[in-house]
């Protein structure tokens, strides 16, 4: 029943990656003519929730007081105006952390690395998992997935970086996950500070996917290079 109305905007506060037990608010912003807002969750048959608009009627709030596994997933919202229902918003992926015990993140051979050399970040979990994610703080595209092929379970994933430049320096964490729901992540690993010494004039590694030309170094996705790790994990950009 989607009509010609512009699609609403959907977002989460304080963000879309939420620790277990924490509160999160999902917002849907439409137009001033909205009469009702509806939030749909993927694979949920009925409208997941519906709310009156808040004055001045251009948005609605959907509150989750305590994040649990049930709330993790992919959402879209709609609004109804006197002429009908809007098109769906772009999806919001709500991810819960804390579903599994935290992995360990280390750097081989060392977290102190000279520019131009190689370093491998190693994410290790106590129990076998099939997806590992490496996150760099303050990166606009922080997620790099390593997912095992054919559902094979692994205890670790390697994220090789070569050649290292100043762009690679910063604070990293990793998460582990099971493939049946990539919306459920482990607790984050303890942070790892990667310190790159050497010239600040190092060339930036060329990205393997297009990025806005206005993006600065911190806006680049992580770019580990080199061969696919021997662990049976396949690299995916998400």
């Amino acid at each position: 029943q989607a009509g010609p109305l512009p699609k609403p905007t959907l977002w989460a506060e304080p963000g879309s990656v939420i620790s277990w037990g924490n509160s999160v608010t999902i917002w849907c912003q439409g137009t001033l003519e909205a009469r009702e807002y509806r939030l749909d969750k993927e694979e949920s048959p009925a409208p997941w929730d519906r709310q009156n608009p808040l004055e001045p009627k251009n948005k609605a709030r959907f509150s989750i007081p305590s994040m649990t596994e049930d709330y993790a997933g992919r959402y879209r919202c709609y609004y109804r105006s006197p002429v009908g229902w809007s098109q769906p918003s772009d999806p919001l992926e709500l991810v819960m952390t804390g579903a599994y015990s935290k992995p360990t993140l280390s750097a081989l051979p060392s977290p102190l690395v000279t520019s131009g050399k190689s370093v491998t970040l190693l994410c290790q979990s106590r129990s076998p998992m099939d997806t590992f994610l490496l996150i760099k703080e303050r990166a606009a595209h922080p997620l790099l997935h390593l997912r095992s092929e054919h559902g094979a379970q692994q205890h670790q994933a390697e994220f090789p970086m070569s050649p290292v430049t100043s762009v690679h320096g910063g604070t990293y964490r990793c998460f582990s996950s099971h493939g049946f729901s990539h919306y459920l992540l482990s607790h984050p690993s303890d942070p790892l500070e990667l310190i790159v010494s050497g010239s600040l004039e190092d060339p930036r590694p060329s990205p393997t996917r297009s990025v806005s030309t206005a993006a600065g170094p911190e806006d680049q996705p992580l770019m580990p290079t080199g061969s696919v790790p021997h662990s049976g994990l396949r690299r995916h950009w998400e």
């Epitope: 029943q1 009469r35 009702e36 048959p45 009925a46 409208p47 997941w48 929730d49 009156n52 006197p82």
Partner: antibody
Framework: QVQLVQSGAEVKKPGASVKVSCKAS????????MHWVRQAPGQGLEWIGE????????NYNEKFKSRATLTVDKSTSTAYMELSSLRSEDTAVYYC?????????????WGQGTTVTVSS | DIQMTQSPSSLSASVGDRVTITCRAS??????LNWYQQKPGKAPKLLIY???RLHSGVPSRFSGSGSGTEYTLTISSLQPDDFATYYC?????????FGQGTRLEIK
């Protein structure tokens, strides 16, 4: 066919609580919101609130927000409405009703009603 | 909350008569207006939803119309089974609200 079967009549004292059940059959319980509506003797219909059986999300009439609690048991396809701190004005027939959720936001199938009498 | 006002509150008519019941909303409800029939000691039954759409199994002598704040239920030719109380209900915003009812009696 769609059926909503409610629990039997209740007599309660002021200050007590009552919990009315509504067992659904003939459709997928988690695919439709459920409403609760009451009707005092000789009076009109008053909306209490609604619940999404798939996730427990609720919307309440502000008048009942502090006293009414809507819940579901997905395993038995049963919806519940609990009303606390009962007073004589709560004497009414309580209905569950299934939501159509399409144009109109109508209530297309209703339970037979549960009479709740509040008397000292 | 949106207030729903029905008129008349009661009405006497004969079998075969054409009857109209009006429902007025305190604000525009964008056609999200539904009509129910209730007989004594029974639960309400949905007749018409979204102003004019007949619910399954409802006889075609029932019809609905209207827009904005004014809506009507019409019974083209009253049958003995139609003597009951009729309620309108808005589904435009929460909370859902009903009219006070119109009691249709045999003349």
């Amino acid at each position: 066919q769609v059926q909503l079967v409610q629990s039997g009549a209740e007599v309660k004292k002021p200050g007590a609580s009552v919990k009315v059940s509504c067992k659904a059959s003939g459709y997928t319980f988690t695919s439709y919101w459920m409403h609760w509506v009451r009707q005092a003797p000789g009076q009109g219909l008053e909306w209490i609130g609604e619940i999404n059986p798939s996730n427990g999300r609720t919307n309440y009439n502000e008048k009942f927000k502090s006293r009414a609690t809507l819940t579901v048991d997905k395993s038995t396809s049963t919806a519940y409405m609990e009303l606390s701190s009962l007073r004589s004005e709560d004497t009414a027939v309580y209905y569950c009703a299934r939501d159509r959720y399409d144009e109109g936001n109508a209530m297309d199938y209703w339970g037979q009603g549960t009479t709740v009498t509040v008397s000292s | 909350d949106i207030q729903m006002t029905q008129s008349p509150s009661s009405l006497s008519a004969s079998v075969g008569d054409r009857v109209t019941i009006t429902c007025r909303a305190s604000q525009d409800i964008t056609n999200y207006l539904n009509w129910y029939q209730q007989k004594p000691g029974k639960a309400p039954k949905l007749l018409i939803y979204y102003t004019s759409r007949l619910h399954s199994g409802v006889p075609s002598r029932f019809s609905g119309s209207g827009s904005g704040t004014e809506y009507t239920l019409t019974i083209s030719s009253l049958q003995p089974d139609d003597f009951a109380t009729y309620y309108c209900q808005q589904g435009d915003t929460l909370p859902r609200t009903f009219g006070q009812g119109t009691r249709l009696e045999i003349k």
